[in-house]
């Protein structure tokens, strides 16, 4: 069947349209195009005779039409009046006629729209704004954009006038945005430039910063005020109601108590005509003088004198505080505070009362500390100590004794041997001693300030010494929880005391430790790994003492249950498997691995590169200690999942 297709159907003014003929019959004589829905000679556009290939214009021909041999009609430079129906009349060779009708629509090419507004500076929560998209155009659709997004759903937004007008009721500061309108028809779409809505608002209640309201005399006061406002607010400061200055910041250097009061910031918006104020109360405190401590006795004598420490200066209605050794005062019957806390009395001072002492004056803002004061407590001398503590020496060695007594001021020392004064030194030295140097050695300590003296007497015996002992053992490598070990101190000697030490300490109380054979033998029953320590024996008699070299007990233990790390049991295909096995053991255990029961390597670490699901299975670590005759093992299941199917556990080492 003969049909007409319009390409395009919607045509922009000035463009062209092709009326394309489909299913044109064979054996044609000619054809004619007509404007309208029927054949009307008065509205013929053009006729065409195939035999002569002659085109003949009709009454409706405008000079913009071109007819093609296939009967299609091209109309150029389209105008609005071209809209409508077009009829093709086909005359066949048998003079039978056929007709077909097509149509198209003509639309203007839209101009770039613009936005007009009824209010360029609306006030927040008060004004409405109506935006209108210009120009008004027939058959056009109007769209609106806010910040390049389609319109939000809001009861304050209303479209009217065929969507050509957008009204914002009760504007808020959040309506400050970029607005665009767009016009569309079937042949074009154009978007306007953006219009920024400038909403006037504020000022909001101003904020004064910093929030601090307490200041110390002599500081600078620097207050800043801010209020949200469009246009930006103008600021004014008032102190106790009196206008100060029209600035956003208020600066007063070196403030005094007189600057205390109420500070008001006023924010004004010249466009909205609104004012808002905020008040802060500033308190300026006087700076007290730095305190200091006086004492009624700068050199008190221990257990005799009392000392009164006074915090200066005296200030009315002030709280006084005290510290000793940077701590608050301890509770002690020897410490007394006066009613106003200004005087601290130490009754019967001791050498531990040296301090340092500090006092403080508290005001509303802070506490001011005095410099520390240290007491010079005179004490001693205490009973002197003679070192070293040895009383037995062998002939031929040098005797070097040192005396010390706690004393302030430091003590003066004197040495006496068998009651005879020797020298006035802290140290006494006698070279190459013999048995004749045995006797009573007295150290006398004297404190020149207190006039007190104290003495200590030490008996020194010079005699041939005992031999250095040694330890023999019945088992150098006992097995934990199985063996006992007997240590014997050699040699056996008459009138000798045997002593034992473990790791430099005297023997612990334990039911597993037993001394026998006059303390010469030390037996450890059921040894544990914790018994692997250094054992020393000592011998002494009335004239000398000696110690053995340490013997370290090498306890064999383990292997304990091994641990396989890392703990992960799920791996991804393609990862490296790096398992490490560890077991506490002495000696170190021998390690071996089995995978699904098949023996692998004898290493502590099992490494398999690029594992696949074929590596799934049980991984067993075996540990063996031939010395204890014990074995242990642990089994771990490993699952390898194909890449992408892992439950998200380790991807291997």
């Amino acid at each position: 069947k003969l049909t007409i297709e319009s390409t395009p159907f919607n045509v922009a003014e000035g463009k062209e349209v092709l009326l394309l003929v489909h299913n044109l019959p064979q054996h044609l004589f000619g054809y004619s195009w007509y404007k309208g829905e029927r054949v009307d000679g008065n509205r013929q556009i053009i006729g065409y005779v195939i035999g002569t290939q002659q085109a003949t214009p009709g009454p409706a021909y405008s000079g913009r039409e071109i007819i093609y041999p296939n009967a299609s009609l091209l109309i150029q430079n389209i105008i609005q009046n071209d809209t409508g129906f077009y009829t093709l009349h086909v005359i066949k060779s048998d003079l039978v006629n056929e007709e077909a009708t097509g149509q198209f629509r003509v639309y203007p090419e839209l101009p770039k729209p613009s936005i007009s507004s009824n209010n360029s500076k609306p006030v927040e929560d008060k004004d409405a704004v109506a935006f209108t998209c210009e120009p008004e155009t027939q058959d056009a659709t109007y769209l609106w954009w806010v910040n390049n997004q389609s319109l939000p759903v809001s009861p304050r937004l209303q479209l009217s006038n065929g969507n050509r007008t957008l009204t914002l009721f009760n504007v808020t500061r959040n309506d400050t945005a970029s607005y665009k309108c767009e016009t569309q028809n079937p042949v074009s779409a154009r978007r306007s430039d953006s219009v920024i809505l400038n909403v006037l608002y504020g000022p909001d209640a101003p904020t004064i910063s910093p929030l601090n309201t307490s200041y110390r005399s002599g500081e600078n006061l620097n207050l800043s005020c801010h209020a949200a406002s469009n246009p930006p607010a103008q600021y004014s400061w008032f102190v106790n109601g009196t206008f100060q200055q029209s600035t956003q910041e208020l600066f007063i250097p070196n403030i005094t108590v007189n600057n205390s009061g109420s500070y008001t910031c006023q924010a004004h918006n010249s466009d909205t005509g609104l004012n808002r104020t905020t008040v802060t109360t500033i308190t300026v405190y006087a700076e007290p003088p730095k305190p200091f401590i006086t004492s009624n006795n700068s050199n008190p004598v221990e257990d005799e004198d009392a000392v009164a420490l006074t915090c200066e200066p005296e200030i009315q209605n002030t709280t006084y505080l005290w510290w000793v050794n940077n701590q608050s005062l301890p509770v002690s019957p020897r410490l007394q505070l006066s009613n106003d806390n200004r005087t601290l009395t130490l009754l019967s001072v001791t050498r531990n009362d040296v301090g340092p002492y500090e006092c403080g004056i508290q005001n509303e803002l802070s506490v001011d500390h005095s410099d520390p004061v240290i007491l010079n407590v005179l004490y001693g001398p205490d009973d002197p100590t003679i070192s070293p503590s040895y009383t037995y020496y062998r002939p031929g060695v040098n005797l070097s004794l040192s005396c010390h007594a706690a004393s302030n001021p430091p003590a003066q020392y004197s040495w006496l041997i068998d009651g005879n004064i020797q020298q006035h030194t802290q140290e006494l030295f006698i070279s190459n001693i013999t048995e004749k140097n045995s006797g009573l050695y007295t150290c006398q300590a004297n404190n020149s300030a207190s006039g007190h003296s104290r003495t200590t007497v030490k008996t020194i015996t010079v005699s041939a010494e005992l031999p250095k002992p040694s330890i023999s053992s019945n088992n150098s490598k006992p097995v934990e929880d199985k063996d006992a070990v007997a240590f014997t101190c050699e040699p056996e000697a008459q009138n000798t005391t045997y002593l034992w030490w473990v790791n430099g300490q005297s023997l612990p109380v334990s039911p597993r430790l037993q001394l026998s054979n006059g303390n010469r033998t030390l037996t450890l029953f059921n040894v544990t790994r914790n018994d692997a320590r250094a054992y020393v024996c000592g011998i002494q008699n009335s004239v000398s003492a000696n110690r053995s070299d340490p013997v370290t007990l090498d306890v064999l233990y383990g292997p304990d249950t091994p641990i396989i790390s890392p703990p992960d049991s799920s791996y991804l295909s393609g990862a490296n498997l790096n398992l490490s096995c560890h077991s506490a053991s002495n000696p170190s255990p021998q390690y071996s691995w089995r995978i699904n029961g098949i023996p692998q390597q004898h290493t502590q670490v099992l490494f398999i590169a690029k594992i696949t699901p074929n590596n799934n299975g049980t991984y067993a670590c075996f540990v063996s200690n031939l010395a204890t005759g014990r074995n242990n093992s642990i089994v771990k299941s490993i699952t390898v999942s194909a890449s992408g199917t892992s439950p998200g556990l380790s991807a291997g080492a």
Epitope: S476, K477, L556, P587, S588, P589, Q590, Y591, S592, Q601, H602, T603, Q604, V605, F607, L626, A627
Partner: antibody, heavy 120, light 107 residues
Framework: QVQLVQSGAEVKKPGASVKVSCKAS????????LHWVRQAPGQGLEWIGY????????SYAQKFQGRVTMTRDTSTSTVYMELSSLRSEDTAVYYC?????????????WGQGTLVTVSS | DIQMTQSPSSLSASVGDRVTITCRAS??????LAWYQQKPGKVPKLLIY???NLVEGVPSRFSGSGSGTDFTLTISSLQPEDVATYYC?????????FGQGTKVEIK
């Protein structure tokens, strides 16, 4: 298969140093400790020391302390043994050998040996 | 250091004979003892470890036994290819020490 390939024979003068290499292949280099053992002509085997290729930790026999240095290069799976202050009694075949496992195991694979001759 | 003493230092036996080599340690080795075979001009080869564990591929005519300080290597039926020097070695911690070796020959 496991292979330990050692560097070639060396002739050194007394007082000099020698550095013998041992390249491992066919197993994970860092998993097994490598020992050095020497054998003087017509004599028995003498342990020199070992290196843990993973950490670089070394342990030497008292006799060689201060004269021997063992190092490793994990990028090439090679260990080195350097012996300094050479004397004529250091003339021997020097073997590198892999420990069968870790901790208290014997030596399962041996290099072909490197003859070091110390002569003036 | 631990001393390892092998005996005899050499022996000569006929093919098919049972051969025994002993190794004595100066301290208890708790079973950490290995045996090596070194054929003339070749490198040592590990036969046995942990006193009695045979290394894979070693003929079953070789066996090890012992405990404490005394250990034995036995060849149940001597073969011509067993001509070699055999060394014992303790492997309980370093320093490792070897026995002085036992040379085995065929009569």
């Amino acid at each position: 298969q496991v292979q330990l390939v050692q560097s070639g024979a060396e002739v050194k003068k007394p007082g000099a140093s020698v550095k013998v290499s041992c390249k491992a292949s066919g197993y994970i280099f860092t998993s097994y400790w490598l020992h050095w053992v020497r054998q003087a002509p017509g004599q028995g085997l003498e342990w020199i020391g070992y290196i843990n290729p993973q950490t670089g930790y070394t342990s030497y026999a008292q006799k060689f302390q201060g004269r021997v240095t063992m190092t490793r290069d994990t990028s090439t799976s090679t260990v080195y043994m350097e012996l300094s202050s050479l004397r004529s009694e250091d003339t021997a075949v020097y073997y590198c050998a892999r420990e069968y496992g870790n901790y208290n195991y014997p030596l399962d694979y041996w290099g072909q040996g490197t003859l070091v001759t110390v002569s003036s | 250091d631990i001393q390892m003493t092998q005996s005899p230092s050499s022996l000569s036996a006929s093919v098919g004979d049972r051969v025994t080599i002993t190794c004595r340690a100066s301290e208890n080795q708790y079973g950490y003892l290995a045996w090596y075979q070194q054929k003339p001009g070749k490198v040592p080869k590990l036969l046995i470890y942990n006193t009695k564990n045979l290394v894979e591929g070693v003929p079953s005519r070789f066996s090890g036994s012992g405990s404490g300080t005394d250990f034995t290597l036995t060849i149940s039926s001597l073969q011509p290819e067993d001509v070699a020097t055999y060394y014992c070695q303790h492997h309980l911690g370093t320093p490792y020490t070897f026995g002085q070796g036992t040379k085995v020959e065929i009569k």
